[in-house]
């Protein structure tokens, strides 16, 4: 057992150009607080995955109001350390996420508004009992300076907090076979209470006679390394030399997860999914209450009045997760039409429309004809977000600026000759044919296959169709 401690030294603009704007203003004073999330191992997990080693919230910092015209200074910080207790062995390697939150103290309806200012993450190796480690992390234009350490809680000692120490029974020296407990030279290493043969490097115990394995080791005495090499069965053959898991109880057998947590096997060990209000490797740590402000993004905390009762966060629309920490990506439903770019701004959904489209979801096809005349008597037709010209006879091209050759498409049927004319084209028909395009045969008896003639014209009269 032990405690991970985090000391924030400063949070403010980082070096270089583009200093961030102050997060607070005279109209909206605010204060900062921090959240730390710890996970065992060196996994690069999403920010929303469980903080299996634990999490902690700082107190709120002093209220800060921006001085108009002044550059954003280092912002006033909360007092004290952030402490994350761990009950089992310290894993030695861990991942951290540190979030800087802003609490706006203006006259919002329904109380203060919270928003995430910066999130930094990293993966580190750290021995328990060592000195403070200093770190600097940058998130955008912000810079966070902090120190951290892991220390064991008596009677545990050692780099993993797995050795136990007891006060000396005799003033001069420790009992037979027992060493002094560095750095507590006035204490002695406790008698071995784990199961006989339990690996001192890879196993530990909290109760006499047991042998619990650190991550990456298995077997009754924690002497078998867990391997991902191919095995004949899910737990592998019963040979310790193969590096496969020995058959027998699986890591989830007997459910090591406390407080109603559910266990799932991982390639190297097991993972507990904890109910709300509990965390830690085995869901054994509780104590977060509504007074700690565990619900982010304006979530409403109910229950959890004391450390033994779980809290529930009722999240505002657009946020999910047990602490309302996860923003829903509304753009995944592709609400913008016609190839518009979707932007989820949190308070609103915006679509950046392609040329030729408008409206809140780019649903309106703009009339591109506005202010775009088609030349030479052409008329503009709207469609597809781009204008199109329907050109007058004799003209073509996008804007009807090109003089067309009306004869290019060979419009005169039955061998008729085509002549371009200012108003279009004229067909000179071959003998035996007539009509604007020489499409009608003239019958030998003088009658034609023309449709009924207009009044005043007899079929067979010479005509010129334009």
């Amino acid at each position: 057992a032990g405690v991970f401690e985090l000391q924030i030294h400063s949070f403010g603009p980082g070096p270089g150009p583009g200093a961030p704007r102050s997060p607070c203003s005279a109209r909206l004073p605010c204060r900062l607080f921090f959240r730390v999330c710890l996970k065992p191992g060196l996994s690069e997990e999403a920010a929303e995955s469980p903080c299996a080693l634990g999490a902690a919230l700082s107190a709120r910092g002093p209220v800060y109001t921006e001085q108009p015209g002044a550059p954003a200074p280092d912002l006033p910080l909360p007092d004290g350390l952030l402490q994350v207790p761990f009950r089992d062995a310290w894993p030695g390697t861990f991942s951290f996420i540190i979030e800087t939150w802003r609490e706006e103290l203006g006259d919002q309806i329904g109380g203060p508004a919270w928003s995430l200012l910066a999130r930094v993450a990293g993966r580190r190796r750290l021995a328990a009992g060592g000195p403070w480690a200093r770190d600097i992390q940058r998130a955008g234009a912000w810079e966070l300076r902090f120190s951290y350490r892991a220390r064991c809680e008596p009677p545990a000692v050692g780099t993993a907090c797995t050795r136990l120490c007891r006060p000396r029974s005799a003033p001069s020296r420790c009992g037979p076979g027992l060493r002094p407990c560095a750095p507590l030279e006035d204490e002695c290493e406790a008698p071995l209470v784990c199961r006989a043969g339990c690996s001192p490097e890879h196993g530990f115990c909290e109760q006499p006679g047991e042998c619990r394995c650190l991550e990456g080791w298995t077997g009754p005495l924690c002497t078998v390394p867990v391997s991902t090499s191919s095995c004949l069965s899910p737990r592998g053959p019963s040979s310790a030399t193969t590096g496969c898991l020995v058959p027998g109880p699986g890591p989830c057998d007997g459910n090591p997860c406390a407080n109603g947590g559910s266990c799932s096997e991982t390639p190297r060990s097991f993972e507990c999914t904890c109910p709300r209000g509990f965390y830690g490797l085995r869901c054994e740590v509780s104590g977060v209450t509504c007074a700690d402000g565990p619900c982010f993004n304006g979530g409403l905390c109910v229950g959890g009045a004391d450390p033994d009762s779980a809290y529930i966060c009722h999240c505002p629309p657009g946020f999910q997760g047990s602490n309302c920490e996860k923003r829903v990506d509304r753009c995944s439903l592709q609400p913008c039409r016609n190839g518009g770019l979707c932007l989820d701004l949190g308070h609103a959904l915006r679509c950046r429309c392609r040329a030729g489209f408008a409206g809140p979801r780019c649903e309106h096809d703009l009339d591109d004809c506005a202010g775009r005349a088609c030349a030479n008597g052409g008329t503009c037709v709207e469609g597809g977000g781009a204008h199109r010209c329907s050109c007058a006879l004799g003209f073509g091209g996008r804007d009807c600026r090109e003089r067309a050759d009306p004869c290019a498409a060979r419009p005169c049927a039955h061998g008729g000759r085509c002549y371009a004319h200012f108003s279009g084209l004229v067909c000179a028909c071959a003998p035996g044919y007539m009509g604007a395009r020489c499409e009608f045969p003239v019958h030998p008896d003088g009658a034609s296959a023309l449709p009924a003639a207009p009044p005043g014209l007899r079929p067979g009269d010479p005509q010129r169709y334009l």
Epitope: G318, Q334, R337, R361
Partner: nanobody
Framework: QVQLQESGGGLVQAGGSLTLSCAAS????????MGWYRQGDLVAGFTSEG??KYADSVKGRFTISRDDAKNMVTLQMNSLKPEDTAVYYC??????????????WGQGTLVTVK
């Protein structure tokens, strides 16, 4: 104002099936997009262009359908797995008139797969 009413959640054995329904009511000019989310991620939905979209983890198991006359979407969930356990939220992007559109959420319906 627009309301989204979800139904169909419950407890089911692994490998079983459930059908979730979501009906939109109120001042609706048109529905632009509508679907189901869980744990902050899209499960399945109809995009603004009318095509069905699915999360990789549910392809082949879940089917989404729509009834435009009833302003309703239905999620048929087959071959359910324990990892499908979640609160499922209906979401819709709805035009209340020609130029006003807003995003709406349902209250959520719990699906538990044992």
């Amino acid at each position: 104002q627009v309301q989204l009413q979800e139904s169909g959640g419950g407890l089911v054995q692994a490998g079983g099936s459930l059908t979730l329904s979501c009906a939109a009511s109120g001042s609706i000019f048109s529905i632009n997009a509508m679907g189901w989310y869980r744990q902050g991620d899209l499960v399945a939905g109809f995009t603004s262009e009318g095509s069905a979209k699915y999360a990789d983890s549910v392809k082949g198991r879940f089917t989404i359908s729509r009834d435009d006359a009833k302003n309703m979407v239905t999620l048929q969930m087959n071959s359910l797995k324990p990892e499908d356990t979640a609160v499922y939220y209906c979401a819709a992007d709805i035009f209340s008139d020609r130029d006003h559109v807003d995003w709406y959420w349902g209250q959520g319906t719990l699906v538990t797969v044992k």
